[in-house]
């Protein structure tokens, strides 16, 4: 099943997030992703856990997953590079870089997103944008068109409370509020964008969604700048 959902959000304006990618397995949406360079998409490492021998591709320039759009194009993946420290049983280092079979054709609906290199926490309360094609309600309805939600960043101390994530949120992770509006498994790999810059990637650990005591967890890309640069080099 697809890993992800946007809960309590609404349909995004078409092609207003030209960095947005759909990581697909055998032609179906699996995870979100974000174009960070002409030939590279950043996603979550856990997304490929279920991929096995399936065909992984990346859809760029899409708003609707099913409807024809002039900007839409499906790319094969030349290689998949999960973070070397990512492990199936933890949310740590949950990053994956996918090299496209060729450089993406850039245009108004396909553009890389600048990513944060300064390793500093986003201020609590900052409103950030998350988008994805994950299910939109607890009944499991999958949207055809991209959804988005605006979420406030939550301070790490609160997120690490025993009633919340109980110390699991390291300095390389960040949290956003999850009170009815939330990202979830199905949006794994998708971007958390603050101030026009990629700050976080939706982690793909399983957790309850839309519950304020279980905030959304995002991998801080700035904390992995050296690794990203080394792979893209």
């Amino acid at each position: 099943p697809p890993r992800g959902r946007i809960l309590g959000g609404r349909e995004a304006e078409a092609h207003a997030r030209p960095y947005m990618a759909s990581v697909q397995l055998n032609g179906a949406h699996l995870c979100g992703g974000v174009l960070v360079a002409e030939q590279w998409v950043l996603s979550a490492a856990h997304c490929l856990e279920d991929a096995a021998d399936g065909k992984v591709q990346v859809l760029l320039g899409a708003h609707s997953l099913s409807q024809p759009e002039p900007s839409k194009r499906l790319y094969d993946v030349l290689r998949a590079v999960p973070h070397p420290d990512s492990q199936p049983d933890t949310i740590d280092h949950d990053l994956l870089l996918l090299q496209l079979s060729e450089k993406a054709t850039l245009g108004p609906a396909v553009r890389p997103l600048p990513w944060q290199r300064v390793d500093r926490d986003v201020a609590p309360g900052t409103l950030c944008d998350v988008a994805g094609w994950g299910i939109v309600n607890h009944a499991g309805r999958r949207p055809d068109s991209l959804q988005h939600v605006l979420l406030p960043v939550l301070d790490r101390a609160t997120c690490n409370r025993r009633t919340h994530h109980d110390g699991a949120i390291t300095e390389r992770l960040m949290c956003a509020e999850s009170n009815r509006r939330d990202s979830c498994k199905g949006d794994s790999g998708g971007p958390l964008v603050c101030g026009g810059v990629l700050e976080g990637v939706v982690t793909s650990g399983s957790r309850v969604c839309g519950n304020r005591k279980k905030p959304g967890i995002y991998t801080r890309v700035a904390s992995y700048a050296a690794w990203i640069d080394s792979v893209l080099a």
Epitope: R10, E13, A16, Y19, Q67, P70, L113, D129, V193, G195
Partner: antibody, heavy 117, light 112 residues
């Protein structure tokens, strides 16, 4: 109903900067991009770029990339455009506009910028 | 970028007359996947902001009088006003949204 209210006319010296505003009402500000369009006196329309107020993402017409900076304040539902290093070529009416689907269905009333020594 | 060329640049008409103006694009605006032309028309009266008239090349915006008709496909498009009224005197712009947004230079409709 959707309304875009732009700031008053600006008179500026060559080399100076101006910052104009566009206050949106009648819809959820963070759900739509805000675009900016330039119109020189007696001339046609030129697309400058847009900001997505939700995440702050911006995209520019390459011609205007070094000239303009687009920002947005979610708390006041206001988009801003700053023009820098002004020359007489920047004298124009600047419109903010909002799309409905792919086309511009809503326009501000325009802000006239006059650059003169 | 896609270049939009409008002709004529100005047009002198009498009230009640039928007028047509042309817009040509440097590449096709027709997407075969949905058979839609990514083109809009706007009207701009003196001292006012542009107003949307037509989108998808031929779909009239709500509230726009039916004397305004958009037609054409691919690279050649036409805006027709079946019987011009004095209030139609304005500049008309075509606009493509197939790729990076560009506008034509406009056709000015004036009284003879």
């Amino acid at each position: 109903q959707v309304q875009l209210q732009q700031s008053a006319a600006e008179l500026a010296r060559p080399g100076a900067s101006v910052k104009m505003s566009c206050k949106a009402s009648g819809y959820t500000f963070t759900d739509y991009t805000m675009h900016w369009v330039k119109q020189r006196p007696g001339q046609g329309l030129e697309w400058i770029g847009y900001i997505n107020p939700s995440g702050g993402y911006t995209d520019y017409n390459q011609k205007f990339k070094d000239k303009t900076a687009l920002t947005a304040d979610k708390s006041s539902s206001t988009a801003y455009m700053q023009l820098s290093s002004l020359t007489s070529e920047d004298s124009a009416v600047y419109y903010c506009a909002r799309r409905r689907d792919y086309w511009f269905a809503y326009w501000g009333q325009g802000t006239l910028v006059t650059v003169s020594a | 970028d896609i270049v939009m060329s409008q002709s004529p640049s100005s047009l002198a008409v009498s009230v009640g007359e039928k007028v047509t103006m042309s817009c040509k694009s440097s590449q096709s605006l027709l997407y075969s996947g949905n058979q839609k032309n990514y083109l809009a028309w706007y009207q701009q009266k003196p001292g006012q902001s542009p107003k949307l008239l037509i989108y998808w090349a031929s779909t009239r915006e709500s509230g726009v009088p039916d004397r305004f008709t958009g037609s054409g496909s691919g690279t050649d498009f036409t805006l027709t006003i079946s019987s011009v009224k004095a209030e139609d005197l304005a500049v008309y712009y075509c606009h493509q949204y197939y790729s990076y947004l560009t506008f034509g230079a406009g056709t000015k409709l004036e009284l003879k």
